[in-house]
């Protein structure tokens, strides 16, 4: 039996032929461990590796730290890759990271990144950003430095408060920060003036709940 | 040492395009965005817009509404600079220039600058 | 946009004096983050271009005289050149670096008296 082929990101997949958007299958090299992940392979040259979607409310994104570590959702719809394997993958190369956002206007955004990483679980998934770029604002949305990934049941934020809890979603909080892609979703007519929705703060302010979200990486020598 | 050279003086008819170069030599061309500036003459500055050669991102004055294009080329570390429908107002000297980022989402500056390149336009 | 507004338009100073300039933005430049001010000052003379002299509003750049402060935060910012060398008379320009378009004032231009 021939050696099973293995990718560990979109972008290897990309590579060896396969050009049509959907789930593939990502294993990371010297691993067994694989996951389900959805492939963009029309945006901007292909090879985007989606880490995050929002787009409907399907999924309830107040999830436990072992959930978003492993992952949860549909990759075809709303979920969350995983910080585990995210964290590993991007500690191997450098990878940029695209956030793409949509409001209830139709209008969309996006905020770039020239180099992105996680670190690991023993640090808290704590986020690296370098580089910005994009028309979602100037300065990040994610606070800078990066801070350690907070949960309902894991508190690292540096607010007295619990962030995670107060504004629901698990996510790189400040005190508790100018984004929460992973806050509540709620539908049209109802997302504004909502604290603990969807936010990215340059882009549409404090109290505007997104349409929708996807986050997206991929090698930076693509 | 870093350099930023940039291509000769142009002159373009108006309604016509002009493409100006920018090649980096002294470090990592993916590491710093390129900024490109202008001044017209007796003018000040104004921003026309920045790429990040890594991804080939970019982010740009809305005030030239679609006439601008940047553009990098990591193979040859040279980044580019097109406008489009060129105007008389549109004769300036255009520069770019590096600018630092770094993990903990402080400002840099822009630290280094090419020479200029002087575009006029004229019938 | 953000607009910035730079006074004097020019400042006559002699060779050894304290230079102020100002520069005012129409919306804060702090960061919501770090509570930094995104305001950077460049120098100019005649036929060169700019020379970054502050970021950060208060940070100089490295190699630039200790006589150049910069100080402020939010709207309202200051360049001093405490004891003016000949080589310091120049156009300066202050910059927006919180949001899009990145705007400059529209120059100091300091002389001699």
């Known amino acids: 039996k021939g050696e099973q082929i293995s990718f560990r990101d979109c972008a290897e997949v990309f590579k060896s032929g396969h050009t049509t958007n959907g789930v593939y299958t990502l294993t990371l090299p010297n691993s067994t461990e694989e996951v389900k992940a959805y492939c963009d392979m029309e945006a901007g040259g292909g090879g985007w590796t989606i880490i995050q979607r929002r787009e409907d409310g399907s999924v309830d994104f107040q999830r436990t730290w072992k959930e978003y570590k492993v992952g949860f959702g549909n990759p075809s719809g709303e979920y969350w890759l995983g910080n585990e394997f995210v964290s590993q993958l991007t500690n191997q190369q450098r990878y940029v990271l695209k956030i793409h956002l949509k409001d209830w206007e139709g209008n969309e955004a996006y905020s770039l990144y020239e180099h992105f990483y996680l670190s690991s679980e023993e640090l808290n998934y704590r986020i690296h950003l370098k580089g910005l770029t994009g028309t979602a604002g100037k300065i990040s949305s994610i606070s800078q430095p990066g801070n350690d990934f907070s949960t309902k049941d894991a508190d690292n934020d540096k607010c007295i408060c619990k962030c995670s809890q107060m504004l629901t979603g698990g996510w790189w909080f400040d005190a508790c920060g100018p984004s929460n892609l992973n806050g509540m979703y709620y539908p049209q007519r109802q997302n504004t003036n909502k604290f603990n929705g969807i936010k990215w703060y340059y882009w549409k302010g404090s109290g505007y709940s997104l349409k929708g979200t996807t986050m997206m990486i991929r090698p930076a020598g693509f | 040492q870093v350099q930023l050279v940039q291509s000769g003086a142009e002159v373009k008819k108006p309604g016509s395009s002009v493409k100006v170069s920018c090649k980096a030599s002294g470090y990592i061309f993916i590491d710093y965005f390129i900024n490109w500036v202008r001044q017209a003459p007796g003018q000040g500055l104004e921003w026309m817009g920045k790429?990040?050669?890594?991804?080939?991102?970019?982010s740009s004055n809305e005030k030239f509404k679609g006439r601008v294009t940047i553009t990098a080329d990591k193979s040859t570390s040279t980044a580019y600079m097109e406008l489009s429908s060129l105007r008389s107002e549109d004769t300036a000297v255009y520069y770019c220039?590096?600018?630092?980022?770094?993990?903990?989402?402080?400002?840099?500056?822009?630290?280094?600058w090419g020479q200029g390149t002087l575009v006029t336009v004229s019938s | 946009e953000i607009v910035m507004t730079q006074s004097p338009a020019t400042l006559s100073v002699s060779p050894g004096e304290r230079a102020t300039l100002s520069c005012k933005s129409s919306q804060s430049l702090l960061s919501s983050g770090n509570q930094k001010s995104f305001l950077a000052w460049y120098q100019q003379k005649p036929g060169q271009a700019p020379r970054l002299l502050i970021y950060?509003?208060?940070t100089r750049e490295s190699g630039i005289p200790a006589r150049f402060s910069g100080s402020g935060s939010g709207t309202e910012f200051t360049l001093t050149i405490s004891s003016l060398q000949s080589e310091d008379f120049a156009v300066y320009y202050c910059q927006n670096d919180h949001s899009y378009p990145i705007t400059f004032g529209q120059g100091t231009k300091l002389e001699i008296k």
């Open positions: 950060g509003a208060s």
């Open positions: 220039a590096r600018e630092a980022f770094d993990y903990d989402g402080d400002y840099y500056g822009m630290a280094y």
């Open positions: 790429i990040g050669p890594g991804s080939g991102s970019s």
